[in-house]
Each structure stands twice: as structure tokens, then as C-alpha cells.
């Protein structure tokens, strides 16, 4: 009898350990990706940024995948997505082609199943960076809460990529899962 | 027999209550600190802001510590950190000494064990605030997801602190724990 | 005896299922509301934005209510609140009444029990949008962690509403519950 009770208890305990493991906070996916500036395209046109670090300095990833410049969702859920993009120019870097700039970021979601790309968030500013000043700087921050499905991909597009600040504290994006889908 | 079973159940129940208490949402550390502008330095150089409220108005803290101008982590984990910094100038607030300003914020992490300070996030803009306009305003927002260890300290540095907006809805920073470290 | 043990186990199991349901991530309230630009007021004064989508495109809501232009809290807790507001002007839209603009957002909380409204977060910038440029753009992002009680209402006020960007990726606000109140 006592043996049987212990077996019952073990079953209860075991099933709850499984449930606990599944729902425990550390199972939640996240990513914080920082710019890899070794291969930033030039030009002022809008481009997708494909080079990001995921495992050095502040960059990290768990239960998500980084591949081909895109952050891939492995687990359905509602995620908070964010991006911080810094642009800068010093006169020692050469003259700007134009003083009137559109400094923009677009956080996009691509679904593989139905090949399509949609902008989730955008931000930025038009700027007049006059030659009278030796240094210019501008940062954009965007963030929002989105439903993401396994297999969907998050990517970052910016205008004027040659003006990006390459520091890990300046240009980054990320995501963390907040809750399951009902 | 029945008594023994109840004892077994109590053990199961008790261990699960412990686990529940540990993993319950309300155990999660957080802080939202708002600027205390009673003694802001007048310089234009970068300074660490040491005066923040933690227990009045929107300001609050739980399972973290505020000491010597720094937000101290008490519990290992992954945290979402954020800061909102507003700068403003009205012609009645004194004459601007320069029209060319760098309005910047740096969110830094200091490790006591290995005395070192690193910038986690930065944001801001260069601005041209002409004396022709009676009022100027600019806000910066940054946010990101970081692994923090117990004992590490978060602090805020800004340029041009004398231009800070002293309202609690304007200049603040905070953190909340999202998940444990695996 | 064995039947009694199973009944005890069922009680344990049942009570834990209840606890699990209560604490499960998918019970957490959230909202992501995107601008409904069909009815945006004109003028440069500060106005409350009352038209938002809650169920189309990226817009969604769960365990919160959207009514009369306000996001209503149904469940006590600590929430992360955020807003992204984009302003834009193209010369084809007509001349600006003034080149000197205050582009601002205010995230406010209203308590019904004690009729009062308070600003939780603000952000923005003064801008000089000269006629020399055919297109102007500027985005604001704010975010912060706040204690909200059931029945409290969150709303968005902006200056210069006629300059709002009507895209769902541009002008939105939201909230998600992070933890319970102790």
C-alpha cells in the first residue's frame, strides 16, 4: 500500500515537474542581436541588414535561430520586439553626398509558408546634417508586441546604412517571448 | 494509512507550493526610477545621474536595490532595461551658450567583482537649438534585453544634464526581469 | 484504500491545474492598438486620439478592453506600456501653417473612481520643418513599467494630429502584463 502511494506521488510529482519545466521562465525564447559592421552596404537606399552578432558581447540568443541575416522564430507566441539604430557622421569620414537625409528603420516579418514580407514597426526622422557641424548623431528606437509563429522571420531594413554606428550599444535589435498564444 | 497518505499529499502539496512561490510572477524584480532634479550639475560634459526617486509618484522598486545613484541587481536573470530622457530649454531658463548640442544618454552596467563599466545602450541626437526659438524639446528612448547578475549595477549617464526635463513622466529609467538564466 | 488515494491525488492534481491555469503565461492581458486615421482631428493643439484598431492587421487585444478611445485595464498588475508615434508631411499635402513645430506624445492614465488624469510618459521634439525640403518625417517612441488597477484607462494625446502617419507600423500603442501586484 505504502509503495503504491509513493508511486502515485511520483506520478503527481513527475507530471508537475514536466509542467513546471514547460512553463518555467527559462524556457522562454529570446534574442538580442548587435550589428556586425564588417559588411555594411554603402549608399543611401533602403537595405536589409544581414550581418548581426548573436554570441559575442551583449549579443545572445536562446530558443530562436539566426540565419541568413534573419531572426527565425522557433516557438509560437506573443513577443516583444525592439530595435535601436544609431546613425552618425564625422567630417573626417568625408563629405556627405547630401545634407538632407532620411534616417529610417523598418522591422519586418517574413512568412515562409505564404511568401510575403510585412513591416511591423517603423521609425526615424528626416535630418538636415549641415557641413557647419563636424559631428552628427541620431538614434531611433522602436518596440512593439506581436504574435509570431514558428518559422516566421524578423529582419531589419535601414536607409543610409553607411552612416550606421557600429557599436554594440548603438545598433541592435531583439525579441523576447512574453506569453503563449491562447 | 489514511493519515500517512495525507502526509504524503502534504509533502507533494508543500513542495509544489514552494515551487509555485519561487516561480510566481510577483516574485519578479523590477524598478521604475524617476529623475530627482534638485541637484543637477550645470556642465555640458557627460555625467552620471545619481539622484532618482524610487518610491514616489510613478517610481517604484521591488527585489532590486537603489543605492548611490545606481540600480543594483539582487537576482540573476534576463531583464528588459529601458530609459526615457527628455531635454528641454525655454528662453527664460537661461541663454544657450551654444546652438550645437549633443543630447545623449548612456545606460551602463558596472560589475563590482571585476571593477569595470560598460555601456549597454546609447541613444540621442545632435541638435541645432537656435536662440531664435523660445522653446526647444527633445526626447530619447532606449531599451534592450540583457543578462544581469546579482551585484551588478545599472546607471545612467547623460550629456548636458542642465537641460534635463525634471518631470517624472519625462526622465526615467527602469528594468523588469523577464526570465531566469538557464 | 486505493480509491481514496486516487481521490487524494485527483485533488492535488486538480488544485495544481487551477494554480497552473491562473499563472499560465497565456492568461496575461495585452493590447497592441494601431491608429485608425479615418477620423483624425486637424489643428496643431494637443488632442486625445480616440480612434484605434484592436482587431485588424497587427492590432490585437486580450483580457483588456478598448472603449471610447481608451484602453481599459481589466486585471490588476504591473504592465509594460509603449507607444510609437510617427509624424510626416509631404509638400503635396499643402503648406505647413508654421515651420516651427512641437511634435509630442503623452501617454495618460485616467482613474474612474477618483476622476483624474495623469501623464505616465511623454516624448517628442521641437522641429524646424523648412519649406526647402519636400518631405519631413519624425518618430517618437516611449515605454515604461507601471502599476495599473482594474478600471483604469490608458489614452494617447498628441500635438499636431493632422501630421500623424496613418500606417499601422507607424502609429500605435500597447501594453502587456508582466507580473501581479504583490
Amino acid at each position: 500500500g505504502s509503495q503504491h502511494i509513493r508511486a502515485e506521488k511520483a506520478m503527481v510529482d513527475g507530471s508537475w515537474l514536466d509542467l513546471a519545466k514547460r512553463s518555467k521562465l527559462e524556457a522562454q525564447p529570446f534574442a538580442h542581436l548587435t550589428i556586425n559592421a564588417t559588411d555594411i552596404p554603402s549608399g543611401s537606399h533602403k537595405v536589409s541588414l544581414s550581418s548581426w552578432y548573436h554570441d559575442r558581447g551583449w549579443a545572445k540568443i536562446s530558443n530562436m535561430t539566426f540565419s541568413n541575416g534573419k531572426l527565425i522564430v522557433n516557438q509560437d507566441g506573443f513577443y516583444y520586439l525592439y530595435a535601436n539604430i544609431c546613425f552618425r557622421h564625422h567630417e573626417t569620414s568625408g563629405d556627405l553626398a547630401t545634407e538632407y537625409l532620411q534616417l529610417m528603420v523598418y522591422v519586418t516579418k517574413t512568412s515562409i509558408k505564404i511568401p510575403s514580407s510585412h513591416t511591423l514597426m517603423k521609425g526615424g526622422s528626416t535630418k538636415y546634417w549641415s557641413g557647419n557641424s563636424e559631428f552628427h548623431f541620431y538614434s531611433i528606437n522602436v518596440g512593439g508586441f506581436f504574435k509570431l509563429r514558428s518559422g516566421e522571420e524578423i529582419s531589419i531594413e535601414v536607409s543610409n546604412p553607411s552612416l550606421l554606428d557600429p557599436d554594440q550599444d548603438a545598433t541592435y535589435f531583439g525579441a523576447f517571448k512574453v506569453r503563449d498564444i491562447d | 494509512g489514511s493519515q500517512h497518505i495525507r502526509a504524503e499529499k502534504a509533502m507533494v502539496d508543500g513542495s509544489w507550493l514552494d515551487l509555485a512561490k519561487r516561480s510566481k510572477l510577483e516574485a519578479q524584480p523590477f524598478a521604475h526610477l524617476t529623475i530627482n532634479a534638485t541637484d543637477i550639475p550645470s556642465g555640458s560634459h557627460k555625467v552620471s545621474l545619481s539622484s532618482w526617486y524610487h518610491d514616489r509618484g510613478w517610481a517604484k522598486i521591488s527585489n532590486m536595490t537603489f543605492s548611490n545613484g545606481k540600480l543594483i541587481v539582487n537576482q540573476d536573470g534576463f531583464y528588459y532595461l529601458y530609459a526615457n530622457i527628455c531635454f528641454r530649454h525655454h528662453e527664460t531658463s537661461g541663454d544657450l551658450a551654444t546652438e550645437y548640442l549633443q543630447l545623449m544618454v548612456y545606460v551602463t552596467k558596472t560589475s563590482i567583482k571585476i571593477p569595470s563599466s560598460h555601456t549597454l545602450m546609447k541613444g540621442g541626437s545632435t541638435k541645432y537649438w537656435s536662440g531664435n526659438s523660445e522653446f526647444h524639446f527633445y526626447s530619447i528612448n532606449v531599451g534592450g534585453f540583457f543578462k544581469l547578475r546579482s551585484g551588478e549595477e545599472i546607471s545612467i549617464e547623460v550629456s548636458n544634464p542642465s537641460l534635463l526635463d525634471p518631470d517624472q513622466d519625462a526622465t526615467y529609467f527602469g528594468a523588469f526581469k523577464v526570465r531566469d538564466i538557464d | 484504500g486505493s480509491q481514496h488515494i486516487r481521490a487524494e491525488k485527483a485533488m492535488v492534481d486538480g488544485s495544481w491545474l487551477d494554480l497552473a491555469k491562473r499563472s499560465k503565461l497565456e492568461a496575461q492581458p495585452f493590447a497592441h492598438l494601431t491608429i485608425n486615421a479615418t477620423d483624425i482631428p486637424s489643428g496643431s493643439h494637443k488632442v486625445s486620439l480616440s480612434s484605434w484598431y484592436h482587431d485588424r492587421g497587427w492590432a490585437k487585444i486580450s483580457n483588456m478592453t478598448f472603449s471610447n478611445g481608451k484602453l481599459i485595464v481589466n486585471q490588476d498588475g504591473f504592465y509594460y506600456l509603449y507607444a510609437n508615434i510617427c509624424f510626416r508631411h509631404h509638400e503635396t499635402s499643402g503648406d505647413l501653417a508654421t515651420e516651427y513645430l512641437q511634435l509630442m506624445v503623452y501617454v495618460t492614465k485616467t482613474s474612474i473612481k477618483i476622476p483624474s488624469s495623469h501623464t505616465l510618459m511623454k516624448g517628442g521634439s521641437t522641429k524646424y520643418w523648412s519649406g526647402n525640403s519636400e518631405f519631413h518625417f519624425y518618430s517618437i517612441n516611449v515605454g515604461g513599467f507601471f502599476k495599473l488597477r482594474s478600471g483604469e484607462e490608458i489614452s494617447i494625446e498628441v500635438s499636431n494630429p493632422s501630421l500623424l502617419d496613418p500606417d499601422q507600423d507607424a502609429t500605435y500603442f500597447g501594453a502587456f502584463k508582466v507580473r501581479d501586484i504583490d
Partner: antibody
Amino acid sequence: EVQLLESGGGLVQPGGSLRLSCAASGFTFSSYAMSWVRQAPGKGLEWVSGITGSGGSTYYADSVKGRFTISRDNSKNTLYLQMNSLRAEDTAVYYCAKDPGTTVIMSWFDPWGQGTLVTVSS
Amino acid sequence: EIVLTQSPGTLSLSPGERATLSCRASQSVRGRYLAWYQQKPGQAPRLLIYQGSSRATGIPDRFSGSGSGTDFTLTISRLEPEDFAVFYCQQYGSSPRTFGQGTKVEIK
């Protein structure tokens, strides 16, 4: 060593004009805001006007607004004060003073020139 | 504008004594943005203290500033013969920058 040397003072009739100069040396002139401060005989100090390092923004006391114009020539390291429609109450020693340069708003004055006397009398 | 009122108008003291000069503002001076100057006859003013309590370069430590809000104090712990002069306070927390009317510290 920072040096400021005022010149251009003298006797002028009410309604007349005068232009003061302040030659600066010993620092990067264009990087600093500058001001004029005056002191009537036997009286206290009164700030008159200020200008940013670039010269892009100028500021005036209400008592001189519309009559005085501050300017600078950064290529010559010189600050100017053009005084028109002078009145008897403008009689004072006029000092040019350097802003500290470490503050974003014009703040204290350090150092000061030795001053130049302007006398408005008929 | 902010009006600064200094007191006393004249302070008669002997060398070696302690001097306490007051500067009161008509409204709060934000950020303790207040400076003190010393002026001797026939000379330009010299900066002593800025930001309420920070000593300027080369100023002896017998000079100290304190206060915040509307009440500020300049203290000379032990008067030296060369310290006798007129002292002015000046605020720079709001426009226009204004000076007090001065306190004369004379030899008794």
C-alpha cells in the same frame, strides 16, 4: 593665459553711437560664448548682452534691446558691441567677459577684461 | 527676472575674523546655479565660486559657498588683508542673468 582687452569707450552725446571692441587671446575664441557686463559709477554689475561661440544666437537685457547689437569676428578673435541711441543711464564701465565653455547655458563670467569707460553726456 | 538681495550692505571686520555674506533670491535658483565674485577698487571682478559651492581655479580654500533654492552664503573662514573688497552674487539659472547689489567687506 587668457586675456581680454576692451577698447572704443569715450564721451558721446545722448542719441549718439559708439562701437566697443574686445580683443581676445590665449584660448580658442570661436568655442566660447562671450558677454558684455557694465557697471555704472559707484553702482553694481549689470549683464548687457551675450553671444554664442558661432555667433548664431544673441541675447540682450531688456534695457538695451533694440539699441545695442552684439557681434563677433572669429577670424579676428574679436567681440563687438555696437551701441546706438545712447542715453545718460548707459554711462558705465563696460567689461567683456568669457563664458566658462563647460556649461550649455551661459553661466558665470571668467575671466573679465579690464573694462572701458563709456560716458553719455551733453 | 530673479532679483538677488545681498546682506548686509557693509560688513566691518578685522583680519582673522570670519565673514558670512548672504544672497537671497526672489525665486528659487534652479540647480544651485549661483556664482560669487570679488571686486577691488579700480579692478574687474574676479570669480570665486560657481555652482553654489565650487571654488574657481586658484581661489584659496578659506572661501566657501553654500546654499540652495533661495538662500545662498559665501563664507570667508579667516579674513586676510587682501580679502577686503566688494562681493557680488550672480544667478544663471534663468534669463536674464542677474547680480546682487553687492556687500562691502571693510576693515574695522
